[in-house]
């Protein structure tokens, strides 16, 4: 089949006192080779600090994945989501609020 | 098919820089992370640093103050530079393609390594 | 950075034996960890990845096993062309790290 671009979401939520659990969440994409890392400062996360889910199909002929990482609150302008796919790439920055939700299709 | 093919100087004076360029053929630099690896004679593999896709930098911390990765997505071409040579850094260096999917993280494919000799 | 030790450095063996090469980590990286074949020639080839999986192309004589500190590569029928030295690499952390290598050799 053809490339399809995934569609990026970068959501957070709370974790504990002072913490909070950033998700990347890539979805509707083929093939399902894809990069998805957390960095910080521009560098990347080691990977046992991060978690991630299986690639899946989601049922439309395409797949979706996560990752997710534990920060402290108040430093969320320092992490972006790393995106590589089908020879494209693009970082997602972390919401400012738990309302806002970022979605980017990429071509 | 994908292939990897490191050039370099060969032999490097003491205290000066090293280029090595790696070119690459059979994927888009823009969509993979290409990674350097060292191997001193009759030693072990040292991971050196990365690059990703869209250029981003990583670099083993015990060398980062000496070492510059960066490349030419149009000419498929990745370079290191190695700054203040010992007779230490006398190894054989291997460009190697990152493949980062989840939990896996793998250098699936190598080139044929350049051989680096610090002697004055 | 963790370290990653080969105790074994060579080791002879007979055409059709099951050798068994190991690999233990200063600390536990989740099966974090990666298997290299090097031929004599320098050239290097992955063998394992994420400590069990088999790449397209590697004969299945090959097995990775193990978890938490110590790992292990299998061949269950050593032929020629085996004839190698064998790298374990963690990624659990950064930098990425390599054992000693454990080379194989013929009796």
């Known amino acids: 089949g053809s490339t399809v671009p995934p569609m990026v979401n970068v959501t957070r939520s709370e974790a504990s006192e002072g913490n909070i659990t950033v998700t990347c969440r890539a979805s509707g994409f083929y093939p399902w080779n894809i990069t998805l890392s957390w960095r910080q400062d521009g560098v990347s996360l080691s990977h046992d600090t991060q978690q991630w889910g299986d690639v899946l199909p989601d049922g439309n002929g395409t797949y979706q994945t996560w990752v997710a990482t534990r920060i402290c609150q108040g430093e969320e302008q320092r992490f972006t989501c790393y995106m590589e796919h089908s020879g494209n790439h693009s970082t997602h920055p972390v919401p400012s609020g738990n309302s806002h939700h970022h979605h980017h299709h990429h071509h | 098919q994908v292939q990897l093919k490191e050039s370099g100087p060969g032999l490097v004076a003491p205290s000066q820089s090293l280029s090595i360029t790696c070119t690459v053929s059979?994927?888009?630099?823009?969509?993979?992370?290409v990674n350097w690896v060292r191997q001193p004679p009759g030693k072990g593999l040292e991971w050196l640093g990365m690059i990703w896709g869209d250029g981003n930098t990583d670099y083993n911390s015990a060398l980062k103050s000496r070492l510059s990765i960066s490349k030419d997505n149009s000419k498929s071409q990745i370079f290191l530079k190695m700054n203040s040579l010992q007779t230490d850094d006398t190894a054989r260096y291997y460009c190697a393609r990152g493949a980062h999917y989840g939990k896996r993280w793998y250098f699936d494919v190598w080139g044929a390594g350049t051989t680096v000799t610090v002697s004055s | 950075d963790i370290q990653m030790t080969q105790t074994t450095s060579s080791l002879s063996a007979s055409l059709g034996d099951r050798v068994t090469i190991s690999c233990s980590a200063s600390q536990g990286i989740n099966n974090y960890l990666n298997w290299y074949q090097q031929k004599p020639d320098g050239t290097v080839k992955l063998l394992i990845y994420?400590?069990?999986s088999l790449p397209s192309g590697v004969p299945s004589r090959f097995s990775g096993s193990g978890s938490g500190t110590d790992y292990s590569l299998t061949i269950s029928n050593l032929e020629p062309e085996d004839i190698a030295t064998y790298y374990c690499?963690?990624?659990?952390?950064?930098?990425?790290?390599f054992g000693g290598g454990t080379k194989v050799e013929i009796k």
């Open positions: 994420y400590t069990s």
């Open positions: 059979g994927f888009a630099l823009t969509g993979s992370g």
């Open positions: 690499q963690q990624y659990s952390k950064l930098p990425p790290t």
